[in-house]
């Protein structure tokens, strides 16, 4: 679609005569009729296939034509066409004399024709004005012409429709040849495809507008290049979505079982050495001078009552010191200068002479001990608590504080490892001497039946169009990661470009 523009510039008819040679009375009031038609090998009468246009009276005899509206007419004259411009044409321009005001062909006598030109032309779209002049013995016509495309039409033949737009159907402006020029941030044949954030992962990310990066299921991060691990995965990572690959020291389906309690929690105090002894289980080996499950208790060296014969113990930085009662001496007051005559036995103990009276020995009643029966019996000295239990004196009795995993008066009983139902997915638990064992149901394996072996939701290849399938272990379902250009839970629907645009 375009317009053939004809600019009449000057008409000369000095003698003011008609084509017949007869003069106009009083002068030739001249108007023009223009016929534009298809190129003919020999210009011949016939329909004006490309259009016609007439002017009002533009002047008398000889005159120049102003290149704007003249008396209601337009100059240049416009001959619009709604087809591909062929590049060649036939042009007929007639100059007529108007005796009156009625310029219709049927209102004019046939001999009112002043002159007529008929040419064959060749003209490309968008050229500058092409100047031409036609001369006869009586008249001369100077004119120029060109072809321009209508709005939204482009190309050598005005045949390419292009309307700039910035909406769902495209984001572009039009180049002079009618090709699309995408607005910044858009690409594709019709500039419908946004250019995602730079670095956005090609497969795992997409966008609906420029500089955006939206992640497909199973992916996260600014550039959608980080996989999302299995829901509930605590201390694990993934290389593909919904995985849960445990970090070192962690186990279980969700990597929430601590296999390295020592490193993760540092439970042993006061420089004690920690040893892992199972899941959430550990043993602290205390440095000298400390006790307790976590070696949290400072041990006084006098607590072991090293001073004999009623000697009193004093803690010192580098050990202890015994203050001996009269009649005794030595590091632990173990040497006596007393005899039975000195009544050295306390708490009702009976004295027996030894070495011809040079020494003695006390026989103590129950609940008392010591070389002079000076000490109440400590029921913990025999270390009655098994499995590392801590012994506590409680008056005339004693009790054991057991380590985790043990019970009973003397911590002699092993708490059942199966009590916490450690076997996943309905596995059966068996207590063993050194732990437990799980017997797994069909479809599961691993130390705790945490590994799914047979039920694989992706086994039936439910995803279409070369999508990647991921199994969600927690729900026995699958997730399809669609390639670019497909959507749907199974990637079964193509994202089609509209076949044409509704402009």
């Amino acid at each position: 679609s375009g317009v053939f523009q004809l600019q009449l510039q000057e008409f000369i008819n000095e003698r003011g005569v008609l084509a017949s040679g007869r003069p106009c009375e009083p002068g030739c009031r001249t108007f023009f009729r223009v016929c534009l038609k298809h190129f003919q090998a020999v210009v011949s009468p016939g329909p004006c296939t490309f259009g016609t246009v007439s002017t009002p009276v533009l002047g008398t005899n000889s005159f120049a034509v102003r290149d704007d509206s003249s008396g209601g007419g337009r100059n240049p004259l416009q001959l619009p066409f709604n087809f591909t411009w062929p590049g060649t044409f036939s042009l007929i321009i007639e100059a007529w004399h108007a005796p009156g005001d009625d310029l219709r062909p049927e209102a004019l006598p046939p001999d009112a024709l002043i002159s007529k030109i008929a040419i064959q032309g060749s003209l490309a779209v968008g050229q500058n004005w092409l100047l031409d002049e036609q001369t006869s013995t009586l008249t001369r016509l100077r004119y120029s012409y060109r072809v321009i495309c209508s709005d939204n039409y482009y190309g050598d033949n005005c045949s390419r429709l292009c309307k700039k737009r910035n909406d769902h159907f495209g984001h572009y402006v039009c180049q002079p040849d009618g090709n699309l020029s995408c607005l910044p941030g858009w690409t594709g044949e019709y500039c419908q495809q946004p250019i995602c954030l730079s670095g956005c992962h090609e497969q795992n990310g997409y966008c609906s507008k420029p500089a955006e990066c939206l992640c497909r299921p199973g992916w996260q991060g600014r550039l959608c290049n980080e996989c999302i691990p299995h829901n509930g995965c605590r201390h694990g990572t993934c290389s593909t979505p919904w995985q849960c690959t445990c970090d070192e020291g962690w186990g279980g389906l969700f990597c929430d079982q601590d296999l390295n309690y020592c490193t993760h929690h540092s439970p042993c105090k006061n420089g004690a050495t920690c040893s892992n002894s199972g899941q959430r289980s550990y043993t602290c080996t205390c440095r000298p001078g400390y006790t307790g499950v976590d070696c949290e208790l400072e041990l006084s060296e006098c607590d072991s009552n090293p001073c004999r014969n009623g000697g009193s113990c004093k803690d010192q930085e580098d050990g202890y010191h015994c203050l001996c009662p009269p009649g005794y001496y030595g590091l632990h007051c173990e040497h006596s200068t007393l005899s039975c005559a000195d009544s050295p036995c306390f708490n009702g103990g009976s004295c027996r002479e030894r070495n011809q009276g040079a020494n003695y020995a006390c026989e103590c009643p129950p609940n008392f001990t010591g070389s002079n029966c000076e000490k109440k019996v400590d029921r913990c000295t025999s270390n009655p608590c098994a499995n590392g239990g801590q012994c506590l004196n409680r008056g005339p009795s004693r009790m054991c504080r057991c380590r985790p995993g043990f019970t009973g008066t003397y911590c002699e009983l092993h708490v059942s490892d199966c009590a916490r139902n450690p076997c996943a997915h309905g596995g059966t638990c068996h207590d063993l001497e050194n732990g437990l064992m799980c017997t797994c149901p069909a479809g599961f394996s691993g130390r705790r039946c945490e590994v799914r072996t047979s039920i694989d939701a992706c086994a039936s290849s439910p995803c279409f169009n070369r999508a990647t399938c991921y199994t969600d272990l927690s729900t026995d379902t699958f997730v399809c990661n669609c390639p670019y250009g497909f959507v749907g839970s199974r990637c079964e629907f193509p994202v089609g470009l509209p076949p044409s645009f509704p402009w």
Epitope: A41, S90, K116, Q134
Partner: antibody, heavy 118, light 107 residues
């Protein structure tokens, strides 16, 4: 009086060249498209070439394309036909003509004979 | 190329006869057709153009008709000066093509 007078014909060997001229008078030469038309001995008329009024458009029949060139000099009211690589089948009487039926124009020259023979 | 098929190729008639010559085009030529008269040693003379328009100075016994692909030249009453060769020419598209000609002879 309208006149079209052709000249430049003659006998020439195959492969050689000739230049025909057509001098116009009695009408405004620059207003009209011009044609060369030939008639071989004992044959019908055959169009050869065309040039538009301003010289911007030219057409040739397939058998002469690339060998013949039509041109015009409006200031001299003269039409030309440069014929190269002549062949025996180019032997004919060559007429120039001004044809514009829209304007009732139909002028023909008497013709000039071209004989291509070894 | 547009082929022009003219018939008859020759015709014998007498003065006063009505004569018809036809030309058929291989495709629509949109009435862009002319009829010429040619006598030996002379230039062709235009009789009819645009299928049915009589050229200035041509006697009215000559007439043309037709459209699309079929065209006719009619001489209503033959005169002695009319014995010559007649041919059609299509001016619709290049290459211009002529009919083979019809030789009109005195019976």
């Amino acid at each position: 009086e309208v006149q079209l007078v052709e000249s430049g014909g003659g006998v020439v060997q195959p492969g050689r060249s000739l230049r025909l001229s057509c001098a116009a008078s009695g009408f405004t030469f620059s207003n009209y498209g011009m044609y060369w038309i030939r008639q071989a001995p004992g044959k019908g008329l055959e169009w050869v070439a065309f040039i538009s009024h301003g010289g911007g458009i030219t057409y040739y029949r397939d058998s002469v394309k690339g060998r013949f060139t039509i041109s015009r000099d409006n200031s001299k009211s003269t039409l030309y036909l440069q014929m190269n690589s002549l062949r025996a089948e180019d032997t004919a009487v060559y007429h120039c003509a001004a044809l514009n039926w829209e304007l009732g124009i139909d002028y023909w020259g008497q013709g000039t004979m071209v004989t291509v023979s070894s | 190329d547009i082929q022009m098929t003219q018939s008859p190729s020759s015709l014998s008639a007498s003065v006063g006869d009505r004569v018809t010559i036809t030309c058929r085009a291989s495709e629509d030529i949109y009435s862009n057709l002319a009829w010429y008269q040619k006598k030996p040693g002379k230039s062709p003379k235009l009789l009819i153009y645009a299928a049915n328009r009589l050229q200035d100075g041509v006697p009215s016994r000559f007439s043309g008709s037709g459209s699309g692909t079929d065209y006719t030249l009619t001489i209503s009453s033959l005169q002695p000066e009319d014995f010559a060769t007649y041919f059609c020419l299509q001016g619709s598209k290049f290459p211009l093509t002529f009919g083979q000609g019809t030789k009109l002879e005195i019976k």
